[in-house]
Interface confidence: medium
Amino acid sequence: FERTRSLQDPCSNCPAGTFCDNNRNQICSPCPPNSFSSAGGQRTCDICRQCKGVFRTRKECSSTSNAECDCTPGFHCLGAGCSMCEQDCKQGQELTKKGCKDCCFGTFNDQKRGICRPWTNCSLDGKSVLVNGTKERDVVCGPSPADLSPGASSVTPPAPAREPGHSPQ
């Protein structure tokens, strides 16, 4: 380690985990508690992120790296670096302004987050429905009727429901 200071910027030799202390003859002082510097040559240390409330600590802050948060059970991360926590729903539901709602008929959600997506339209690919879709699962498309061997039959798509359910489970 070259301990001679740069003539241009004496702070350039200060490593991560320190700040260049102008009040103390520009020595490299350790970052104070609850702060960090992830790069060298910094004149201040950054305040550590605090994982509070619905956020929980995934990685503690150190003198060289910020804390990382994730979400408490029942919530999931949104945004860069988990900047927000959004409520989980059940599979077969999506989060609306009024809370978790069942997927409308013809749509599904196989995760606890995100929105309900339409079932695959098998006929667009010239295929038939092999397994019906549900609120939690997409349809499974099978071979086209022309590909079926004699005597085989495709599953008949279900008749549409009169009114999709919207009551939360």
Epitope: F1, N13, G17, N25, C28, S29, P30, C31, P32
Partner: antibody, heavy 118, light 107 residues
Amino acid sequence: EVKLLESGGGLVQPGGSLKLSCAASGFDFSRYWMSWVRQAPGKGLEWIGEIHPDSSAINYTPSLKDKFIISRDNAKNTLYLQMSKVRSEDTALYYCARSYYGRVFDYWGQGTTLTVSS
Amino acid sequence: DIVMTQSPATLSVTPGDRVSLSCRASQSISDYLHWYQQKSHESPRLLIKYASQSISGIPPRFSGSGSGSDFTLSINSVEPEDVGMYYCQDGHSFPPTFGAGTKLELK
């Protein structure tokens, strides 16, 4: 259990040199700043200097920076204090200390004694 | 360098007493003030960090207060094993400095 064990002290003639060691165990040595602090007989505590976890910054109390060199070997979990041109006023008990997040000395060794005498 | 002044130099106490040890910094150091206990022929031991934060394993009878330049270490019911030297330390400035200490002894 955090343990710090200094060694290498002894009787040295004025103008001589000596290297003290501090063996660390019970914690991740490579993640902590480490310091040396000394205590002259019947006197208070005097901070000597500190070293960054990866040795990329080393700070000394200004009056001692030309005669002491602090180093560390993370592979051996060991901190060192190289002393040169020692004088009678360097006679003291030398402690190594772990620095918690800056300059809180949360664990101390038992100390090793340097006696400078002709 | 910042000068740390401790008072009194010696404090004679009776077990069960509540005592206060003072530490004054020559300029403001915010709450970057740490207290150590050193018993005879032993190493220093961290008692309080950042003026008032307790340390795991330290008996709750030890507490700290203060900010800026005036700080106090309190022992709310002195035990015989508390005799020894008590040092305050400035962790804010460079170089970090210790007070000269307060000697706690039994009457």
